[in-house]
Interface confidence: medium
Amino acid sequence: TALSPTPTTMTFTPAPLEETTTRPEFCKWPCECPQSPPRCPLGVSLITDGCECCKICAQQLGDNCTEAAICDPHRGLYCDYSGDRPRYAIGVCAQVVGVGCVLDGVRYTNGESFQPNCRYNCTCIDGTVGCTPLCLSPRPPRLWCRQPRHVRVPGQCCEQWVCDDDARRPRQTALLDTRAFAASGAVEQRYENCIAYTSPWSPCSTTCGLGISTRISNVNARCWPEQESRLCNLRPCDVDIQLHIKAGKKCLAVYQPEEATNFTLAGCVSTRTYRPKYCGVCTDNRCCIPYKSKTISVDFQCPEGPGFSRQVLWINACFCNLSCRNPNDIFADLESYPDFEEIAN
């Protein structure tokens, strides 16, 4: 199961070679390789060259590259030949960049985080914008508050709960200091009466294949809202799950491949195999979304250099219903917020 998204294919049509232009041959057959493979600097991958012959140290960002001396695939690099017209023989290693996003006429690069206003933090992930609310006003404390109201406070970005029957508020529940949640002021002190808050995870940014999901949590030393992220893969793009729906049924809520496989991410491989569960599909107009899930930590080992771990959504169960107009509309969870229009325009 590849967690890695297919990199945006960077294609260009080379101009026809002029007859006077000779293109150098970088590969020789039969292969001629040194007796022992080279020792690569720390963090540089030892890979098979583009001729499928010898072990070489992968070219790094900004290095020259050829069909033989290829760029480090584990760092998401590709050989950009655009500067070597018309031969297209020697290129420069460049970063594979995902598709950017456009929101309200503003272009954002892949991976860029931005705040369209003081209430939301958004991230562009491969053509999709995912947003999480920064206004973390907790639910009104139901135990004592009989008439809660959500009001705008002059000079503050986020609405806050006020309780009209404040006089009846018992002493022991006076924990809430809304200053700890106000996203408008950059207050860096720790509040003793900080209430731990973690928002729900945002919907996965893609309906199939690798996506990203984010949430806000103030469970940190500063009691300050910070964004956490995890990888998510709701369903594979290359499997027709409808074929797996049992006879007489309209939906398959959960699809699980037969074989356990390793997750791969940027050329690195998970240290153990997994048999992930995916949300299924329906033959009617219902959609299937995660219902029971958890976040697991997946350890990756890279061919060369250090490994790393990533938080990954693990789907336990899904349900199929009519309410999700678009199974993973990145804005689906935001529609209940008063300023949704400010983002979605």
Epitope: K249, C251, L252, A253, V254, Q256, R275, K277, C288, Y291, K292, S293, K294, W314, N316, A317, C318, F319, C320
Partner: antibody, heavy 121, light 107 residues
């Protein structure tokens, strides 16, 4: 380590209802598929119902259909099993059991301590 | 419903003996079979899942095997603390049915 904590023993009259709770302290109920199993005195285990991930809904054994309701309150991480129209043969220990979810269908790797329900006039 | 037929219903063996309990499914359940141990007055505990996988923390003297629709729980060397009732369960198709149980005693 996941723990399931069930409510205390109940004594009910025939025709009444009983609601047994099962709390998951320090863990999220949304990560678990919850099931209920009962065991009459000196008898074997009997599956009553639980969450079926393949269909994406809670399903009940035919025997209990219409009499049992299983619900979950994710805000308190508590599962409930309510059995109505009680009769003497419903006297049993009621267990909540959970599966952790690595497979679509999973064995019950965590069990509550059991709640004794006695139905007697 | 899938019927799980477990045998024997009770057995008595000596400490150190090799003990086997069998379970037969009335139809194909693939490897979706679990074995549980229930000590008197306690809740059941998972021993084996997926037919032959040992649940973490369970002593290695317990093992499971499968052959078609026949499943076997083996205790390689019986210990006094193994006195309990043992149940098989299929969890492939709802309703998830249990075998009638095997009561194991020490001679």
């Amino acid at each position: 380590e996941v723990q399931l904590l069930e409510s205390g023993a109940e004594v009910k009259k025939p025709g009444a209802s009983v609601k047994v709770s099962c709390r998951v302290p320090g863990y999220s109920l949304s990560e678990l598929s919850m099931h209920w199993v009962r065991q009459a005195p000196g008898k074997g285990l009997e599956w009553m119902g639980g969450f079926d991930p393949e269909d994406g809904e809670t399903i009940y054994a035919q025997k209990f259909q219409g009499r049992v309701t299983m619900t979950e309150d994710t805000s308190t991480d508590t599962a409930y099993m309510e059995l109505s129209s009680l009769r003497s043969e419903d006297t049993a220990v009621y267990y909540c059991a959970a599966s952790g979810g690595w497979e679509v269908h999973d064995a019950f790797d965590t069990w509550g301590q059991g709640t004794m329900v006695t139905v007697s006039s | 419903d899938i019927v799980m037929t477990q045998s024997p219903s009770s057995l008595s063996a000596s400490v150190g003996d090799r003990v086997t309990i069998t379970c037969r499914a009335s139809q194909d359940i693939s490897y979706y079979l679990a074995w549980y141990q229930q000590k008197p007055g306690k809740a059941p505990e998972l021993l084996i899942y997926a037919g032959s996988s040992l649940q973490s923390g369970v002593p290695s003297r317990f093992s499971g095997s499968e052959s078609g629709t026949d499943f076997t729980l083996t205790i390689s060397s019986l210990q006094p603390e193994d006195v309990a009732s043992y149940y098989c369960q299929q969890y492939k198709t709802a309703p998830y049915t249990f075998g009638q149980g095997t009561k194991l005693e020490i001679k």
